[in-house]
Interface confidence: low
Amino acid sequence: CEAPPTFEAMELIGKPKPYYRVGERVDYKCKKGYFYIPPLATHTICDRNHTWLPVSDEGCYREMCPHIRDPLNGEAILANGSYEFGAELHFICNEGYYLIGKDILYCELKDTVAIWSGKPPLCEKILCTPPPKIKNGKHTFSEVEVFEYLDAVTYSCDPAPGPDPFSLIGESMIYCGNNSTWSHAAPECKVVKCRFPVVENGKQISGFGKKFYYKATVMFECDKGYYLNGSDKIVCESNSTWDPPVPKCLKVSTSPTTKSPTSSASGPRPTYKPPVSNYPGYPKPDEGILNNLDD
């Protein structure tokens, strides 16, 4: 017989020879990382027809790495379904926890046994340092030194020393998020005041007031015979300017060949009626809405 068969899980005991006599026996053993479970034979004999008697490595089983439980507050996920060497174990932590240690362990061979490539990680709680302090404002829980995952703080602005209040620009509430970072940048407290929006040949239809602070919104419509060039709705933004810019009311062309541009406002336009009584936040009827009431 020529050289005996080779196997994935089993190896020849001793050195192979180029030829074997009829009746000669060879013995196998399980390779490193495999263990033997009887009763299947691990030897074969050179038969008189110069072939080896049937033998297989089915009695050799792969060594397995020890079972690893889910980490507390996390999960261990077996990438390829078994604990045999070559396996990968992936670790993830529950929401609100972060991993201390390696996120993947490999089942490796060391000498004759399968062992994990390292120690299982731990899932520890996500903590944040205190959020930033801001000028002209403060946040809740300012005395707390360490915040847990999803703990939130709310910012507010201090009373302003002058006639105009501080406006809070940005997110008023931020929370401790993943990677131990806050969900948003700290907001800013500053005076934001836009000039009174004057639109000649037009009128305000909402957002009446003497002063226009951050996020104040005003809507306009044009007088009859005029069309709106720009947006019918403007907002006072953090740099104390209107966005979009204050629109203009332009005269509608009477030429029969030109089509009148239409207002950018969609839908029917409400008619303006001055308030019958002086509601708070509305101009007095005799002040009119086109007067510049900006202080």
């Epitope: 439980r69 889910d70 507390l72 507050n73 529950n94 201390i100 120690k119 731990l122 899932c123 709680k125």
Partner: antibody
Framework: QVQLVQSGGGVVQPGRSLRLACAAS????????MHWVRQAPGKGLEWVAV????????YYADSVKGRFTISRDNSKNTLYLQMNSLRAEDTAVYYC?????????WGRGTLVTVSS | QSVLTQPPSVSGAPGQRVTISCTGS?????????VHWYQQLPGTAPKLLIY???NRPSGVPDRFSGSKSGTSASLAITGLQAEDEADYYC?????????FGGGTKLTVL
């Protein structure tokens, strides 16, 4: 205020049972592993049992295995320790504690005295 | 007999530096598991002092620090104060079991 409020301690005869409770206020415990730790009079701390956040995994110290059962009712925000077949050596202050690898919040403790 | 070994007592004068050792084995501290430290003032529940070998939770002064090397760890307290007089416990983990040292009584002279 975040705290763990314990109840259920007292004097009990050997062989009898007792159930301890630990109610959380100011935090929701269903995201956290919870433990019981005990301290015999004048002795050190001894870890007793842990339960995972979802209640699926429970581990016990060898000294209480088969006698004590840890459980939790996340809807009530409460942790329990059912102690059966009590022995004199179980006499201790029992603390509930929150955390994973370490215990970052502890109850005030409840004294269990096993005596005939 | 605790699996983690601590000296039963240590002492120091106010302002001094003291250290408390915690010796484990290759199956706990030496296996890469973190060491945590707890302070127990007389008549009160333990309080987390150091977690993850050397991290301080909120409210713990930076006079307290922890370190770990091989199979042992230590807690250092600098600028000793009268209110530091307490029992100190180290803690670690192995195979589903949480371990405590026997505790060390710190006396401020």
């Amino acid at each position: 205020q975040v705290q763990l409020v314990q109840s259920g301690g007292g004097v009990v005869q050997p062989g009898r049972s007792l159930r301890l409770a630990c109610a959380a206020s100011g935090l929701t415990v269903n995201n956290y592993a919870m433990h019981w730790v005990r301290q015999a009079p004048g002795k050190g701390l001894e870890w007793v049992a842990v339960i995972s956040y979802d209640g699926n995994n429970k581990y016990y110290a060898d000294s209480v295995k088969g006698r004590f059962t840890i459980s939790r009712d996340n809807s009530k925000n409460t942790l329990y320790l059912q102690m059966n077949s009590l022995r004199a050596e179980d006499t201790a202050v029992y603390y509930c504690a929150k955390g994973g690898g370490y215990f970052d919040l502890w109850g005030r403790g409840t004294l269990v005295t096993v005596s005939s | 007999q605790s699996v983690l070994t601590q000296p039963p007592s240590v002492s120091g004068a106010p302002g001094q530096r003291v250290t408390i050792s915690c010796t484990g084995s290759s199956s706990n501290i030496g296996a890469g598991y973190d060491v945590h430290w707890y302070q127990q003032l007389p008549g009160t529940a333990p309080k987390l002092l150091i977690y993850g070998n050397n991290n301080r939770p909120s409210g713990v002064p930076d006079r307290f620090s922890g370190s770990k090397s091989g199979t042992s760890a230590s807690l250092a307290i600098t600028g000793l104060q009268a209110e530091d007089e307490a029992d100190y416990y180290c803690s670690s983990y192995t195979s589903g079991t949480w371990l405590f040292g026997g505790g060390t009584k710190l006396t401020v002279l």
